[in-house]
């Protein structure tokens, strides 16, 4: 059975217009966070605020799904650690990055360890 996906949403801003077609949510910067979604209905166009979740892996039905490697070591200088995700699946019309880098703060424990290592002059 064919699945109906990427459907247009009815109503929406200026709902005197019968059928609005909405594009994907495009973050204002980087790969996630607050952004805008453009809609068209006949000659009318609208932009609405939207949010692309930064928690790509857990977000059900996200436009872009990634397979992530393990978190890297804590960087004592920035207090963050990084991991890379490779595109696993994209919604048909979603213009997803092939790879993304996600950063998160180190836990206090790993931060302390990283600082201790740095203090000992180790890489």
């Amino acid at each position: 059975v064919a699945k109906k996906k990427d459907k247009v949403k009815k109503g929406g801003p200026g709902s005197e217009c019968a059928e609005w077609a909405w594009g994907p949510c495009t973050p204002s910067s980087k790969d996630c966070g607050v952004g805008f979604r453009e809609g068209t209905c006949g000659a009318q166009t609208q932009r609405i605020r939207c949010r692309v979740p930064c928690n790509w892996k857990k977000e059900f039905g996200a436009d872009c799904k990634y397979k992530f490697e393990n978190w890297g070591a804590c960087d004592g200088g920035t207090g963050t650690k990084v991991r890379q995700g490779t595109l696993k699946k994209a919604r048909y019309n979603a213009q997803c990055q092939e790879t993304i880098r996600v950063t998160k703060p180190c836990t206090p424990k790993t931060k302390a360890k990283a600082k201790a290592k740095k203090g000992k002059g180790k890489d």
Epitope: K4, A21, G23, K89, A90, E98
Partner: antibody, heavy 117, light 107 residues
Framework: QVQLQQPGAELVRPGHSVKLSCKAS????????MNWVRQRPGQGLEWIGM????????ILNQKFKDKATLTVDISSNTAYMQLSSPTSEDSAVYFC??????????WGQGTTLTVSS | EIVLTQSPATLSLSPGERATLSCRAS??????LHWYQQKPGQAPRLLIK???QSISGIPARFSGSGPGTDFTLTISSVEPEDFAVYYC?????????FGGGTKLEIK
């Protein structure tokens, strides 16, 4: 860059099912939707359906629901389309294409299917 | 299903002239409209995606406009290698559909 290889031609007898192949090489096959398109002699393009290799999610044109079955084999980077009970109406060129909304698509050169006894 | 109507069916031009090809959708499809070129015996080649987005390796003389229901592919100055059949395709909803094509021929 993705390259898609399809056999140039296939001959099948009416009523005998046939399985067309589309082998991908180059960038990751499993990340992108694989489309199948039919073009009858002297005619336009007709979308049959698509499959996503990562989880085999399939979206089929209802017109082809009793005709085409799409599958993938991740281990060999190959997509397949099986056509059941072919008739002379199914004689056409069948293309596969790998779609990414970000970079565009890549097409195979097409398989000319001839249904004849 | 969404019906795409292309016009004209045939367009006769000389090299160097400007080509304007039209594709009209039976309902609004946002910017989910793509343009392909096909030459005899070859697979289609993507020229423009999402109404106006350019494709790597495609000459700058090809451009597209939208969104909504009326879309245009423009070839600013037709080259001899541009004579072919051009198809529009929508990806706004299933099934994906193609227009009937416009044949660009030498005058």
């Amino acid at each position: 860059q993705v390259q898609l290889q399809q056999p140039g031609a296939e001959l099948v007898r009416p009523g005998h099912s046939v399985k067309l192949s589309c082998k991908a090489s180059g960038q990751s096959f499993s990340s992108y939707w694989m489309n199948w398109v039919r073009q009858r002699p002297g005619q336009g393009l007709e979308w049959i359906g698509m499959i996503h290799p990562s989880d085999s999610e399939t979206i089929l044109n209802q017109k082809f629901k009793d005709k085409a079955t799409l599958t993938v084999d991740i281990s060999s980077n190959t997509a397949y389309m099986q056509l059941s009970s072919p008739t002379s109406e199914d004689s056409a060129v069948y293309f596969c294409s790998s779609w990414s909304a970000k970079r565009g698509d890549f097409w195979g050169q097409g398989t000319t299917l001839t249904v004849s006894s | 299903e969404i019906v795409l109507t292309q016009s004209p069916a045939t367009l006769s031009l000389s090299p160097g002239e400007r080509a304007t090809l039209s594709c009209r959708a039976s309902e609004s499809i946002s910017n989910n409209l793509h343009w392909y070129q096909q030459k005899p015996g070859q697979a289609p080649r993507l020229l423009i995606k999402y109404a106006s987005q350019s494709i790597s390796g495609i000459p700058a003389r090809f451009s597209g406009s939208g969104p909504g229901t009326d879309f245009t592919l423009t070839i600013s100055s037709v080259e001899p290698e541009d004579f072919a059949v051009y198809y529009c395709q929508q990806s706004n909803s299933w099934p994906l559909t193609f227009g009937g094509g416009t044949k660009l021929e030498i005058k």
